[in-house]
C-alpha cells in the first residue's frame, strides 16, 4: 500500500494554517488499525502517533519550511512511509507603512505622553519597526514583533521633541518607511515679566508710557492683557510670540499699580505688580512720574 | 505616478515679487519635504530650502532667508515659493524636488521655472 | 557652509572609456547620525537633475550598473565604466549632511 502526504493549502501564507492528511488510496483506514505520524525535515510533529490522519498546524510561519512526510503503522507494527513533501511558506512583505500619534493630530502638551503608532497594512512574519526623528533621521529604537503594529513612546514630551517623525517597518523585503508627521509640542506660558518705559528718567504728564509685557515662554499666538488697578487698559497679540507692548498717554491719574496677563489658550498668567507714583522735584512746575 | 508641475515661465522687474507654484501629484502630499533648488544661467545649483505641506513648517539656507518665503496648500497639493525685492541676480531657473526620507535623496524634480528679470 | 568641489571641470570622453570624477568635501560629511550624505545627480541640457547614486555607494533603481560611488569623509568618486551617448551632460555632487546643503560646481562629460 502506498501512502501520500497531502498539505492544505499546498503553499500557505505566513500565519495562516494548514492541514496535513496522511492518505492511502487503496486502502481504508477503517479495513485495519492505523497509527499516524507527521514528520518535518528529522522532528516528528504535533502528538506523535495518533489515530488521526490529519495533523492541523494553527499557523505557519517561514522557517516551518521544509520537507515534510507522514508515516502509518498497523497494528502488525509495520510501517508505511509517504516521500517528502516540501511546503514553501510564504512570506508577505510590508506594504503601506503608517505612522500616527497619540494624541492624534501630533499636538502634545509639555510634560504629557506622547505614542508613536507604526502600522503596516500588510506583511507576516517578524516585522522589524524602527522609529526615526527628523527627516535627516536619527534612530530612536527598534522593536521587532509579530504584529501589524507597533508603539515608542515618550512619556514626557520636551520642547526639544517638537520635530518631524517617521517610522520604517522590515520583514526581509527591504525597508518601507511612512510618511513625516510633524510634532508640535504646546507650552503654556510662563508668568510674564512687565516692563514700564517712559521716554526720560522722569516721565511727566502727556508723556507717552510703554508698557511691556513679555512671557519668556509659551506657545504663540499669545494674548496680553493690560491692567491699572485691575482695571482693562486694553489688549495686544503676539502672533509668533515674543512680547507686546501697550502705549498710554499720561494724565495724573496714571498712578498707581500696573500689571500684564498673558494667556496662549493652554493658561493664563499675570505678571507682578509694578508700582508708578507721581513725585513732585523741588522747584519743578509740573508733576513727574517714577516707577 | 508621481509627479511635480512647475508654474511657467515669468518675466518681471526688478524690485517686484514673484510666485512660483509646485503642484504634487501620485502621492501623499503632506508625507515628504519639498525642496527648492536655484540654477543661475550656465552655472550650478543652490539649495535654498524646504517645506514641509503636513504644517508648514521650514528650513532655509541663510543666503535666501528674506528673500524667500515657501507656503503651501494641503487643499490643492501645491508648494509655493516667493521671491521678493527681485534683483538680477535673482534671474535663474528655479526647480523644486522630493527628498524622501530613510533613503534619503530627491526622488522626482519639478520641470524648473525660468525667472527672468527685465527693465 | 561645506564646499563642495568637484574635478575635472569638463571631461572630454569617447563612447565606451572608463573615467572617474572627483568631488572633495571642505569638512567630514559624516552626519552626527553616522550616515554620510553625500549624493551624484546628472542634468542633461534643459532638463532637471536626475539622481544616479545616493548615500555614497547606492545606485537608484533604474541606475545602469556602469555608474558606481565609492568614498568616504572628505574624498568621493564617481566612476562610469563605460560611457554611453546618453551619459553625456553635468554631473553633480551633493551634501545632504549639513545645512545648508550643498552642490558641486558640477563636471560636464562631453564628447571629445
Known amino acids: 500500500a502506498e501512502l501520500f502526504l497531502i498539505a492544505s493549502p499546498s503553499h500557505p501564507t505566513e500565519g495562516s494554517p494548514v492541514t496535513l492528511t496522511c492518505k492511502m488510496p487503496f486502502l481504508q483506514s477503517s479495513d485495519a488499525q492505523f497509527q499516524f505520524c507527521f514528520f518535518r525535515d528529522t522532528r516528528a510533529l504535533g502528538p506523535g502517533w495518533s489515530s488521526s490522519p490529519k495533523l492541523q498546524i494553527a499557523a505557519m510561519w517561514k522557517e516551518d519550511t521544509g520537507s515534510y512526510w507522514c508515516e502509518a503503522q498497523t497494528m502488525a507494527s509495520k510501517v508505511l512511509r509517504s516521500r517528502r513533501s516540501q511546503i514553501n511558506v510564504h512570506r508577505v512583505p510590508v506594504a503601506d507603512v503608517s505612522l500616527e500619534t497619540q494624541p492624534p493630530g501630533g499636538q502634545v502638551m509639555e510634560g504629557d505622553r506622547l505614542v508613536l503608532i507604526c502600522s503596516v497594512a500588510m506583511g507576516t512574519g517578524d516585522i522589524t519597526f524602527l522609529w526615526y526623528k527628523g527627516a535627516v533621521g536619527l534612530n530612536l529604537q527598534s522593536k521587532t514583533q509579530r504584529s501589524l503594529t507597533a508603539e515608542y513612546e515618550i512619556p514626557s514630551v520636551r520642547e526639544s521633541d517638537a520635530e518631524q517623525y517617521y517610522c520604517v517597518a522590515e520583514n526581509g523585503y527591504g525597508p518601507s518607511p511612512s510618511g513625516l508627521v510633524s510634532i508640535t509640542v504646546r507650552i503654556p506660558v510662563s508668568r510674564p515679566i512687565l516692563m514700564l518705559r517712559a521716554p526720560r528718567a522722569q516721565a511727566a504728564v502727556e508723556d507717552v508710557l510703554e508698557l511691556h509685557c513679555e512671557a519668556l515662554r509659551g506657545s504663540p499666538p499669545i494674548l496680553y492683557w493690560f491692567y491699572h488697578e485691575d482695571i482693562t487698559l486694553g489688549s495686544r497679540s503676539a502672533p509668533s510670540g515674543g512680547g507686546a507692548s501697550f502705549n498710554l498717554s499720561l494724565t495724573e491719574e496714571h498712578s498707581g499699580n500696573y500689571s500684564c496677563e498673558a494667556n496662549n489658550g493652554l493658561g493664563a498668567q499675570r505678571s507682578e505688580a509694578v508700582t508708578l507714583n507721581f513725585t513732585v522735584p523741588t522747584g519743578a512746575r509740573s508733576n513727574h512720574l517714577t516707577s | 505616478q508621481v509627479q511635480l508641475q512647475q508654474s511657467g515661465p515669468e518675466l518681471v522687474k526688478p524690485g517686484a515679487s514673484v510666485r512660483i507654484s509646485c503642484k504634487a501629484s501620485?502621492?501623499?502630499?503632506?508625507?515628504?519635504?519639498i525642496h527648492w533648488v536655484k540654477q543661475r544661467p550656465g552655472q550650478g545649483l543652490e539649495w535654498i530650502g524646504w517645506?514641509?505641506?503636513?504644517?508648514?513648517?521650514?528650513k532655509y539656507n541663510e543666503k535666501f532667508k528674506g528673500k524667500t518665503t515657501l507656503t503651501a496648500d494641503k487643499s490643492s497639493s501645491t508648494a509655493y515659493m516667493q521671491l521678493s525685492s527681485l534683483t538680477s541676480e535673482d534671474s535663474a531657473v528655479y526647480f523644486c524636488?522630493?527628498?524622501?526620507?530613510?533613503?534619503?535623496?530627491?526622488?522626482?524634480w519639478g520641470q524648473g521655472t525660468t525667472l527672468t528679470l527685465s527693465s | 557652509d561645506v564646499l563642495m568641489t568637484q574635478t575635472p571641470l569638463s571631461l572630454p570622453v569617447s563612447l565606451g572609456d572608463q573615467v572617474s570624477i572627483s568631488c572633495r568635501s571642505g569638512?567630514?560629511?559624516?552626519?552626527?547620525?553616522?550616515?554620510?550624505?553625500l549624493e551624484w545627480y546628472l542634468q542633461k541640457p534643459g532638463q532637471s537633475p536626475k539622481l544616479l547614486i545616493y548615500?555614497?555607494?547606492n545606485r537608484f533603481s533604474g541606475v545602469p550598473d556602469r555608474f558606481s560611488g565609492s568614498g568616504s569623509g572628505t574624498d568621493f568618486t564617481l566612476r562610469i565604466s563605460r560611457v554611453e551617448a546618453e551619459d553625456l551632460g553635468v554631473y553633480y555632487c551633493?551634501?545632504?549632511?549639513?545645512?545648508?546643503?550643498?552642490f558641486g560646481g558640477g563636471t560636464k562629460l562631453e564628447i571629445k
Open positions: 569638512q567630514t560629511i559624516v552626519h552626527s547620525n553616522g550616515n554620510t550624505y
Open positions: 517645506i514641509y505641506p503636513g504644517d508648514g513648517n521650514t
Open positions: 551633493f551634501q545632504g549632511s549639513h545645512v545648508p546643503w550643498t
Open positions: 524636488a522630493r527628498r524622501i526620507h530613510y533613503f534619503d535623496y530627491f526622488d522626482y
Open positions: 501620485g502621492y501623499t502630499f503632506t508625507s515628504y519635504n
Open positions: 548615500k555614497v555607494s
